[in-house]
């Protein structure tokens, strides 16, 4: 039994880090493998993660952490019974994938303005809380070419756009994702999308 693709890990910079790897053949990850992880700290102890299958030869493990600070470093040991298959380390602050924003809502009752709001996925005491910026994706269910991205570079989790920038009388969907420049993170997953019917009053034409 050998590791074909070494574990790579990403952290949500809160409580979970996810590690994925590939074996050299079909593997029952949860019965055959264990991933041991330990914070490099005098008084820490090793924790065991039981991996799940992620495709035939792929495994994924969700490492639980109390919290994360920038200095944290973890040792990782991948075991198959008594055999050490791989040994490595992981610094969560250098491999951050933020949590996806939630509660995306489209408010359509504000005088021909669409107000999109969502929730910051982090509590106020988490470092990322004040460092997230967002991308909002809006697309038409009827027209695949009607697809746009709005970059929200301010901290407030909201976006205002004129309803008239979208076509009237058709349905749109929106979703939002986050990233943090300070840790050069990857983008989060997209939030669940929300749907609304776009309608606004056309201004009277002047003749």
């Amino acid at each position: 039994m050998k590791v074909l693709q070494e574990p790579t890990c990403v952290s949500d910079y809160m409580s979970i880090s996810t590690c994925e790897w590939k074996m050299n053949g079909p593997t029952n990850c949860s019965t055959e493998l264990r991933l041991l992880y330990q914070l490099v700290f005098l008084l820490s102890e090793a924790h065991t993660c039981i991996p799940e299958n992620n495709g035939g030869a792929g495994c994924v493990c969700h490492l639980l952490m109390d919290d994360v600070v920038s200095a944290d470093n973890y040792t990782l040991d991948l075991w198959a019974g008594q055999q050490l298959l791989w040994k490595g380390s992981f610094k969560p602050s250098e491999h951050v994938k933020p949590r996806a924003p939630g509660n995306l809502t489209v408010h359509t009752n504000v005088s021909d303005t669409l107000l999109l709001t969502w929730s910051n996925p982090y509590p106020p005491d988490n470092y990322l809380y004040n460092h997230l910026t967002y991308a909002v994706n809006i697309w038409s269910e009827n027209d695949p070419a009607d697809f746009r991205i709005y970059n929200v570079t301010y901290l407030e989790p909201s976006l205002r756009i004129a309803a008239s920038t979208l076509k009237s009388g058709i349905s749109y969907r929106a979703r939002v994702r986050a990233w943090a420049q300070c840790y050069n993170t990857t983008w989060s997953e997209w939030s669940p999308s929300t749907k609304w019917h776009n309608s606004y009053r056309e201004p009277f034409e002047q003749h």
Epitope: F41, L42, L43, S44, E45, D66, V69, S70, A71
Partner: antibody
């Protein structure tokens, strides 16, 4: 709410023994390392000893090595410090502290006086 | 003699910004993170800053920490009378397999 309550302090003669206890509540005791820190009257704080969450690893300051023994009972949510061969310089308030990278919660302390 | 050196005293007037330093000896390993504790008169110490610059919830953002090599600093802005206390720095020393603490800085708020 995290609470740490030390007990067992008192007056003891040089060469004598005392056992301090620290009752913990408000958090999952078995998941945290714990430590003892002391402070002689009017003096600096001094780290005494620490123990990992399972009790597998234990560390002592040189000044108490061989005389003090730290232990824990996770079923009782209690930390202990057995102090033998006590000396006058062990006189101090002894604080129990929870460890999460640093000493993030402290008890109010129990006074140990070593005097003849 | 502590491995970490702090000035014995510091002072400032209300509203001022005060900085307290904590220096490791030249041979002191610089891999560890610094922590800061506040001890108000007659009370147990309280964690103020951990892992160099992180504040536990409930600690006002007037308190901030920073680290440079084997030294650390605690800054208190908008000084208040209730900040009058002893401030200790500490770090895990992996070469000693233990925790080392500075001998504290007594902060006096004047006026």
């Amino acid at each position: 709410e995290v609470q740490l309550l030390e007990s067992g302090g008192g007056l003891v003669q040089p060469g004598g023994s005392l056992r301090l206890s620290c009752a913990a509540s408000g958090f999952t005791f078995s998941r945290h390392a714990m430590a003892w820190v002391r402070q002689a009257p009017g003096k600096c704080l001094e780290w005494v000893s620490a123990i990992t969450s399972s009790g597998r690893s234990i560390y002592y300051a040189d000044s108490v090595k061989g005389r003090f023994t730290i232990s824990r009972d996770n079923s009782k949510n209690t930390l202990y410090l057995q102090m033998n061969s006590l000396r006058a310089e062990d006189t101090a308030v002894y604080y129990c502290a929870r460890v999460h990278r640093a000493f993030d919660y402290w008890g109010q302390g129990t006074l140990v006086t070593v005097s003849s | 003699q502590s491995v970490l050196t702090q000035p014995p005293s510091a002072s400032g007037t209300p509203g001022q910004r005060v900085t307290i330093s904590c220096s490791g000896s030249p041979l002191f390993p610089d891999s560890g993170s610094f922590n800061w504790y506040q001890q108000l008169p007659g009370t147990a110490p309280k964690l103020l800053i951990y892992a160099d610059s992180h504040r536990p919830s409930g600690v006002p953002d007037r308190f901030s920490g920073s680290k440079s090599g084997t030294s650390a600093s605690l800054a208190i802005s908008g000084l208040r009378s209730e900040d009058e206390a002893d401030y200790y720095c500490g770090t895990w020393d992996y070469s000693l397999s233990g925790y080392v603490l500075g001998c504290g800085t007594k902060l006096t708020v004047l006026g």
